[in-house]
């Protein structure tokens, strides 16, 4: 008997497991800079981190997770969106670099946003037309009476036992799926060696199935993304984020689950389920 249905069942199981684990994943935050990402020396810049409603801490990370700034001054931009603003009043060369956002929405931390590269250049006489991710201005803009600068926020903690079991379970299912696929491929090879397939359809169908699975997964991932969140108030001074100046930018993939080097505030148990990190680098022209 052909293992065709078995392989399909394996794929369906795999798919169901993946979608199940994605069920409670948080949407990635977005990051933008105002007035842009190319800033004259001495001018101000505001990083805007946006995420879903209910975010309690937004973190702006610079270059690596060891340099970050937290704010709990989160504004509700709309019934389904929240944002925080991190302002640098007087940009120095040391502020140039890669920035990204991450947020804490109980009981867990989100993935990081894409990187945004801040370029600092010498002030020139003429007006700038900086490369920027345009922000949609929606609703009244109020200024808060204080710019709280919160140093620490709860860091992602180690895996709890139950999460370890889930992880092992997912791994086992994944390996089982791989094994099924390998066996299926071997079986197909044997069939090919033994003689030509009975019909064209029979040859094509197995190759189409994985694509279908990938397509469903991609659409699931798309649905979890929140984009184009409007702007609102709250700004936090981020001058503490200024680190050593660097002429060249090194793109490094950072471990999302590594503990930060700062002392992190104790927090009640939270889900620390690892997730595949898809890093997109913001391509910005140097002037």
């Amino acid at each position: 008997m052909s293992p065709h249905p078995t392989a399909l069942l394996g794929l369906v199981l795999c798919l169901a497991q993946t979608i199940h684990t994605q069920e409670e994943d948080l949407p990635r935050p977005s990051i933008s800079a105002e007035p842009g990402t190319v800033i004259p020396l001495g001018s101000h810049v505001t990083f805007v981190c946006r995420g879903p409603v209910g975010v309690q801490t937004f973190r702006l990370e610079r270059d690596s997770r060891s340099t970050y700034n937290d704010t709990e001054d989160v504004s509700q931009a709309s019934p389904s969106e929240s944002e925080a603003r991190f302002r640098i009043d007087s940009v120095r060369e040391g502020n140039a670099g890669l920035y990204r956002c991450i947020y804490y929405k109980p009981p867990k931390w989100s993935e990081q946003s894409d990187y945004l590269e801040l370029l600092v250049k010498e002030s020139s006489g003429g007006p700038d037309s900086p490369d920027t991710e345009p922000g949609s201005s929606a609703g009244p803009t109020q200024r808060p009476s204080d710019n709280s600068h919160n140093e620490h926020a709860p860091a992602s903690q180690g895996l709890k036992a139950e999460h370890l079991y889930i992880l092992i379970g997912v791994s086992v299912v994944f390996l089982f799926c791989l094994l099924l696929l390998v066996l299926f491929c071997l079986h197909r090879q044997n069939q090919i060696k033994q003689g030509p397939p009975r019909s064209k359809d029979e040859e094509q169908k197995p190759q189409q199935r994985p694509d279908l699975a990938v397509d469903v997964l991609e659409r699931t991932a798309d649905k979890a993304t929140v984009n184009g969140l409007p702007e609102k108030d709250r700004e936090t001074d981020t001058s503490a984020l200024a680190a050593g100046s660097s002429q060249e930018v090194t793109y490094a993939q950072l471990d999302h689950w590594a503990l930060t080097q700062r002392t992190a505030r104790a927090v009640s148990p939270q889900s620390t389920k690892p997730m595949a990190e898809s890093i997109t680098y913001a391509a910005v022209a140097r002037h």
Epitope: E23, E24, P52, V53, G54, Q56, T57, E72, V74, S75, Q76, P79, Y104, K105, P106, P107, D146, S148, N150, A153, P154, E162, H163, R265, A266, V267, S268, P269, Q270, S271
Partner: antibody, heavy 121, light 109 residues
Framework: EQSLEESGGDLVKPGASLTLTCKAS?????????MCWVRQAPGKGLEWIAC????????TYFASWAKGRFTISKTSSITVTLQMTSLTAADTATYFC?????????????WGPGTLVTISS | ELVLTQTPAPVSAAVGDTVTIKCQAS??????LAWYQQKPGQPPKLLIY???TLASGVPPRFKGSRSGTEYTLTISDLECADAATYFC???????????FGGGTEVEIK
């Protein structure tokens, strides 16, 4: 309409244990909320006890004074319980169940009417 | 641990007056506040969350604001139905916990 109702309040002796139950109507627990317990001693203020995450994981949050003696758990997608042990007269209060939802930035809404727990010998 | 201190203790005002209740947070972390109204024999009712956002169905006579670590609930055009005890609460799931203030009773003259 979304509502909550507590049950299990009783008159018990010091040192006894008691389990309170909160049942949701009009909604079931989801990954965007927490189910919480708050108590209020007669003529006193509100005192937060504990919360449990409504999603797949069972993340729990406790007031520092409540750790150890109190246990919060989800028994179904619409019920949450609060187990209390080694009860003393100081635990005499009306116990409220409330939902803490991200849409209200985790403000507690709705609340149940409360169930009275009296500890007396 | 976060401590929320509410002042004044009891407030007495006439119908049509404006009443201001303050809630002072002991630290500037995780202190986005919610305000509740509680009448005798009833559970509390959410009025304001995220320090200044009105909860559904709450009249705009109730206004929340923040200045540093001081949070204010202002009730304008006071009505008889506003006679109640008002509580502030930190709605942060971090180490501060979900602390409540001691409560402020508002009575109508």
């Amino acid at each position: 309409e979304q509502s909550l109702e507590e049950s299990g309040g009783d008159l018990v002796k010091p040192g006894a244990s008691l389990t309170l139950t909160c049942k949701a109507s009009g909604f079931s627990f989801s990954s965007s909320e927490f189910m919480c317990w708050v108590r209020q001693a007669p003529g006193k203020g509100l005192e937060w006890i504990a919360c449990i995450y409504g999603g797949l994981s069972d993340d729990t949050y406790f007031a520092s004074w409540a750790k150890g003696r109190f246990t919060i758990s989800k028994t179904s997608s619409i019920t949450v319980t609060l187990q209390m042990t080694s009860l003393t007269a100081a635990d005499t209060a009306t116990y409220f169940c409330a939902r803490s939802c991200d849409v209200n930035y985790y403000g507690f809404d709705p609340w149940g009417p409360g169930t009275l727990v009296t500890i007396s010998s | 641990e976060l401590v929320l201190t509410q002042t004044p203790a009891p407030v007495s005002a006439a119908v049509g007056d404006t009443v201001t209740i303050k809630c002072q947070a002991s630290q500037n972390k995780g202190t986005n506040l919610a305000w509740y109204q509680q009448k005798p024999g009833q559970p509390p009712k959410l009025l304001i969350y995220l320090s200044s956002t009105l909860a559904s169905g709450v009249p705009p006579r109730f206004k929340g604001s923040r200045s540093g670590t001081e949070y204010t609930l202002t009730i304008s055009d006071l009505e008889c139905a506003d006679a109640a005890t008002y509580f502030c609460q930190s709605t942060y799931y971090g180490s501060n916990g979900l602390t409540f203030g001691g409560g402020t009773e508002v009575e109508i003259k």
